[in-house]
């Protein structure tokens, strides 16, 4: 009995034409939604003039359907038992699941001003930038629609820069008609314990963003894991959104539509400072903002974003050190709403439900030569938005799963 089931599972989770795993892997059968909450700044003038705390009010959800496109350029390599692919990006706005429209306006940090002043720290260049910022009537904050903020807009300040720079700015620009990858993952044919584990990403086994082990591409992409998952396991996965590999640990048993699943969560330890978790030393890339690597809960991914000062955190700075959230008013972190979890069916290793939550922040620093940043007395890691990407196995698929997998075992 058990051996037969094991044999069947091993056969069905291989990533090759004809298996259950392959069919769902190429194009997810689950509807995946990405909800956005935008942090609307309530006191832009006070911040700019007096370096006050930034008062934010989250507005959302604004929901998009994502991950509905099939993987592209799927190529098997029989020699090393891998399959390579591109994961195309696409987002469709869902008005019925949103509090407003894509034309809703928000007061947010001026992305171009914050980024340019960080990238170009030479004071003369900042004086040039200042004259262009003034000429374009740009400021520290700006009013943008949801569509502009997420998917891109032509920035008036950058449009005046007299040498070639990308003048379109957006938190996820470019997105539609782009793809993530190339990923090359093990198909599990020769060794089922390696199935879905990433061999290379963009042709490399390392990211080139971090030092030492932090730079490694570990585990799968979190959509599935090798079968026969144990509660004691630490599940490693790579997320291109945060430019790093991370891990999840078992939290609890959950019943999902009659299917017993293991809930794995990202622990606070993964976001800890090197003081508390020495393994994280290589995620601390500079000493000033991180207060000599004692701050925690924010990840500087600027190296992965062409030098733009992007910091990733959990929503509302969950698991972050007090110094990070101190200059921001209006945040209310709570685990239930703001942590990331994966519900994994342990026999197959398939992720049947997940909630991936993260927050995009931008660093803005005082600048002596940029008028609109001149009055700042401190650095701010400014929350721009947080997102909740969720997927749950459909009822039909759950029935099929129960009858074909868990039902047979029980």
């Amino acid at each position: 009995g058990d051996l037969l089931i094991q044999k069947t599972i091993k056969k069905q989770v291989v990533l090759e034409e004809g298996t259950i795993a392959f069919k769902n892997w190429v194009k997810t059968g689950t509807e995946v939604y990405r909800q956005f909450w935008i942090f609307d700044v309530q006191n832009p003038q006070e911040v700019m003039m007096n370096s006050s705390n930034i008062q934010v009010k989250q507005r959302g959800p604004y929901t998009y359907r994502v991950r509905f496109l099939a993987k592209e350029n799927v190529t098997q390599d029989a020699e090393d038992n891998t399959v390579s692919f591109l994961q195309p990006n696409g987002a469709i706005f869902e008005p019925s699941l949103s509090v407003g429209t894509e034309a809703d306006n928000f007061t947010v940090l001026n992305l171009a001003v914050a980024a340019a002043s960080h990238i170009y720290q030479n004071q003369f260049v900042q004086m040039i930038l200042n004259s262009l910022i003034n000429k374009s009537k740009s400021s520290m904050f700006q009013v943008r629609t949801l569509r502009e903020l997420l998917w891109g807009y032509r920035d008036p300040f950058l449009s005046l820069v007299p040498y070639p720079v990308t003048t379109t700015v957006g938190l996820f620009y470019p997105y539609n008609n782009t793809a993530d990858g190339v990923y090359k993952v093990f198909n599990g044919k020769d060794n089922i314990s390696k199935v879905a584990i990433i061999d290379t990403y963009k042709g490399k086994r390392n990211l080139s963003y971090w030092e030492s082990h932090c730079d490694m591409i570990n585990g799968t992409d979190a959509a599935s894991f090798p079968p026969f998952v144990e509660k004691s396991q630490v599940l490693q996965f790579f997320s291109s959104d945060i430019c790093r590999s991370i891990y999840a640990v078992f939290e609890s048993d959950v019943n999902l539509k009659g299917i017993p699943v293991y809930r794995f969560v990202l622990p606070s330890k993964a976001f800890a400072s090197p003081v508390e978790n020495p393994d994280n030393y290589c995620f601390c890339t500079e000493k000033i903002i991180s207060k000599n690597c004692t701050s925690y809960g924010v990840l500087d991914i600027s190296k992965c974003k062409e030098g733009r000062p992007v910091y990733i955190s959990l929503p509302h700075f969950l698991y972050a050190s007090p110094d990070v959230s101190e200059p921001i008013d209006g945040l209310n972190p709570n685990e239930e709403e703001h942590r990331t979890y994966l519900d994994i069916e342990p026999i197959t290793g398939f992720t049947l439900q997940f909630a991936k939550r993260l927050q995009v922040n931008l660093l803005v620093k005082p600048s002596e030569k940029i008028q609109v940043l001149k009055n700042l007395k401190r650095n701010y890691i400014v929350p721009i938005l947080w997102l909740n990407e969720t997927g749950t196995i459909g009822d039909e698929k759950a029935n099929m799963f129960r009858s074909q997998v868990t039902g047979k075992i029980n």
Epitope: Y120, N122, F124, I128, S131, Y163
Partner: antibody
Framework: QVQMKESGAELVRPGASVKLSCKAL????????IQWVKQTPVHGLEWIGG????????VYNQKFKGKATLTADKSSSTAYMELSSLTSEDSAVYYC?????????????WGQGSLVTVSA | ETTVTQSPASLSMAIGEKVTIRCITS??????MNWYQQKPGEPPKLLIS???TLRPGVPSRFSSSGYGTDFVFTIENMLSEDVADYYC?????????FGSGTKLEIK
């Protein structure tokens, strides 16, 4: 140590052009901008413009737009200023100087100056 | 454009006396004023940079003060080697603008 080595004196005819050079030594050329300054007995010191080789940022004093053209060659750590359509008003000593960089020490290092004389 | 008005144009002082030169700007420039000394046949030399910062190697008899639009450069006890032209430069905004200079001579 930091040095700015300028080209020598030039005697040029009215209407002609002249290209002055400034070789930067003792620091990373792309980190700091090079500024050009004109000095005459009548107008004293006047800022012409500056170029930041690292970012390709160039800015001119409106007064010298069309008169001066600034360029930089990263491979030789040399900055150039071309002055065109010369008149007697352009007779002056021209200095290249290293800019403030990151600490607000504006024009801390100067070249020895290039004397340009415009005469028929 | 920020204009810089420097005074006096020339100054004749005895050795050991206190020398004061003033620069007034047409716009508020915080403390972004710099002071230079130029001796005949030489390029200008930076003495004091933004924030009234005395440059390394510059004798402490030189100092400056001021914020906003009014700036003063002082030589506490004038020495014969201080005979030179002195210029101020505002570095708050572009274009950089110099004062017209002060010629310091020995009385």
């Amino acid at each position: 140590q930091v040095q700015m080595k300028e080209s020598g004196a030039e005697l040029v005819r009215p209407g002609a052009s002249v290209k002055l050079s400034c070789k930067a030594l003792g620091y990373t050329f792309t980190d700091y901008e090079i500024q050009w300054v004109k000095q005459t007995p009548v107008h004293g010191l006047e800022w012409i413009g500056g170029i930041h080789p690292g970012s390709s940022g160039i800015v001119y004093n409106q007064k010298f737009k069309g008169k001066a053209t600034l360029t930089a060659d990263k491979s030789s750590s040399t900055a150039y200023m071309e002055l065109s359509s010369l008149t007697s008003e352009d007779s002056a000593v021209y200095y290249c100087t290293r800019g403030g960089g990151y600490d607000g020490a504006w024009f801390a290092y100067w070249g020895q100056g290039s004397l340009v004389t415009v005469s028929a | 454009e920020t204009t810089v008005t420097q005074s006096p144009a020339s100054l004749s002082m005895a050795i050991g006396e206190k020398v004061t030169i003033r620069c007034i700007t047409s716009t508020d420039i915080d403390d972004d004023m710099n002071w230079y000394q130029q001796k005949p046949g030489e390029p200008p030399k930076l003495l004091i940079s933004e924030g009234n910062t005395l440059r390394p190697g510059v004798p402490s008899r030189f100092s400056s003060s001021g914020y906003g639009t009014d700036f003063v450069f002082t030589i506490e006890n004038m020495l014969s080697e201080d005979v030179a032209d002195y210029y101020c430069l505002q570095s708050d905004n572009l274009p950089f603008t110099f004062g017209s200079g002060t010629k310091l001579e020995i009385k």
